[in-house]
Amino acid sequence: EVEKTACPSGKKAREIDESLIFYKKWELEACVDAALLATQMDRVNAIPFTYEQLDVLKHKLDELYPQGYPESVIQHLGYLFLKMSPEDIRKWNVTSLETLKALLEVNKGHEMSPQVATLIDRFVKGRGQLDKDTLDTLTAFYPGYLCSLSPEELSSVPPSSIWAVRPQDLDTCDPRQLDVLYPKARLAFQNMNGSEYFVKIQSFLGGAPTEDLKALSQQNVSMDLATFMKLRTDAVLPLTVAEVQKLLGPHVEGLKAEERHRPVRDWILRQRQDDLDTLGLGLQGGIPNGYLVLDLSMQEALS
């Protein structure tokens, strides 16, 4: 292999162009100047290099920038980004949203890779918070992005960013995440009128406390069963039959189909059977007439 280290006569690359696609790996290594590559990175994506060849180009950039690539190079990495390891990316300082978009575009249509996750983490940490433009961009590429964050990470999302969140972005969020996001959403949408407010807040209601559900029940919101089934069980249990009836409006008849599932099942067990009968749905399992209900949790709190 020693004789292959020198660039053959006449093969020295003067620019990054299509002629390089028939260079063997060792020829790329020997004949392409790393500084030339760095200044013409924007051309690489338009040339049908194999990933084997891209490996060589990456190696040249790594030698030129051992401390991490400058953003001027990162922005034009294109498919070469797929060759980067999380360790490579941790050396980068990515501050431009345009750079982030360019790299996410390369991975579009594919699951979030460790490289992408690291890139996003570096970008968000560099910005200090998950601002609206960043969240807009990330959820456009990865609808489940928000739900991949821990409650601690979500706490850095400013309420103003909540406007960028679409219902499908919350599909995979668990109750702990919604507990963090709901107060932010409530704050973000607080100046909207009743019906508009409900449309916006609806997908966040899995984090709503009992008092907010009670307040909503006074506003003729007609909550659908799918939303009701995602509410926190502990928030639903204290609601009266009348409050649930007002909250669901015409959707109240859907309770029958869900009577064996939480939170409906647990809520039924807490209601007087007499009250449940007023719904006319045949819901069974309530507290029989004449029984006294002791709230032991209240008793424990007092003692």
Partner: nanobody, 115 residues
Framework: EVQLVESGGGLIQPGGSLRLSCAAS????????MGWHRQAPGKEREWVAT???????YYANFVKGRFTISRDNSKNTLYLQMNSLRAEDTAVYYC?????????WGQGTLVTVSS
């Protein structure tokens, strides 16, 4: 994953023609471009031709004007039409797909040009 299966190789006389085919299956939506490479006995594998998803073609100097690369997207098949074959074209011809995020290779098909 992308699977590639080449066919069409065989024994041919100098000056003759052959058409190689490469059937692609699997995650073909991730393919960025495809190409043909060849490896003659005792030599390194060398690049022959490439075609991009939009149909742009590239050829090595030694096959320009003699070989034509094409693809039929409806059949997920890549072709290499080889005309005016010479003894030095004898090699195992490999189909390659560059797809997110790696290169996939077929098992190769042998072309022997001999009288």
């Amino acid at each position: 994953e992308v699977q590639l299966v080449e066919s069409g190789g065989g024994l041919i006389q100098p000056g003759g023609s052959l058409r190689l085919s490469c059937a692609a299956s699997g995650n073909i939506g991730s393919i960025r471009h495809m190409g043909w490479h060849r490896q003659a006995p005792g030599k390194e594998r060398e690049w022959v031709a490439t075609i991009t998803t939009v149909g742009t073609t590239y050829y090595a100097n030694f096959v320009k004007g003699r070989f034509t690369i094409s693809r039929d997207n409806s059949k997920n098949t890549l072709y290499l039409q080889m005309n005016s074959l010479r003894a030095e074209d004898t090699a195992v011809y490999y189909c390659r797909a560059t797809a997110h995020p790696t290169d996939y290779w077929g098992q190769g098909t042998l072309v022997t040009v001999s009288s």
